[in-house]
């Protein structure tokens, strides 16, 4: 069964800056990736970025830079201040869609006791939905 992993890291140099990395562990080709915060996209979460493998990338504040790392993984840098700034317990979710085969979504947040700039290697996160 395909899985999605999510890794959240706070940058040591800028404490209001977060890096979210997500990956798809499966054999299907990805048609769209949606990154949201505050919960799953479409279930109370707010969209931060949408990435299409061929047509480009769309992103919204406080997302600063979204990009493909590989054909099956993406990264997103968030930077905010005030109301739009993420906090340490913010939940970030990534949904990988392979239309029409299915979509897989997982969420993650900053590890409770992690030092800024340090994080464990990405591990598969629980799948919240597989359509």
């Amino acid at each position: 069964t395909p899985e999605v992993w999510v890794q959240v890291r706070m940058e040591a140099t800028e404490l209001s800056s977060f890096t979210i990395r997500c990956g798809f562990l499966g054999s299907g080709s990805i048609s769209l990736v949606t990154v949201s915060w505050g919960g799953p996209n479409g279930a109370g979460g707010t969209t931060l970025a949408v990435l299409h493998p061929e047509r480009g990338i769309r992103q919204w504040a406080p997302a600063r830079q979204a990009r493909w790392e590989t054909q099956s993984s993406i990264s997103l840098i968030l930077e905010g201040s005030g109301a739009s700034s993420p906090c340490a317990n913010t939940t970030f979710c990534c949904k990988f869609a392979s239309f029409p085969e299915g979509s897989w979504e997982a969420c993650g947040s900053l590890p409770p006791s992690s030092d800024p700039g340090l994080s464990a290697p990405p591990t598969p996160a629980p799948i919240l939905r597989a359509d």
């Epitope: 769209l32 479409g42 109370g44 707010t46 969209t47 949408v50 299409h52 047509r55 869609a97």
Partner: nanobody, 120 residues
Framework: EVQLVESGGGLVQPGGSLRLSCAAS????????MGWFRQAPGKGLEGVAT???????KYADSVKGRFTISRDNAKNSLYLQMNSLRAEDTAVYYC??????????????WGQGTQVTVSS
Amino acid sequence: EVQLVESGGGLVQPGGSLRLSCAASGFTFSGDCMGWFRQAPGKGLEGVATIDNAGRIKYADSVKGRFTISRDNAKNSLYLQMNSLRAEDTAVYYCAAGWTFGGQCSPADWGQGTQVTVSS
């Protein structure tokens, strides 16, 4: 959980009509477009008709003048009126919600699909 449920598919004779419906529930859609896509046996996925939040509508050349897409925001529903159906319209039709890239709607969520078969 996101749910898009299609209905209205079936078997129809060439020249006949069908109306597909798609009911969206369980979520507040955050994308900017919705549409109908289809996949014929042994063929790739094809965008049939899409509509964005501004009401802009696009049709595949193969269905222009025969198919009409519409939506009812109050009912959270999307429709596809298909007239003058041809054998080549036979496919599984998917209702999808997504994001616009380069003027094209890219699905982020979709239903299970409904089979449309045009045959005498």
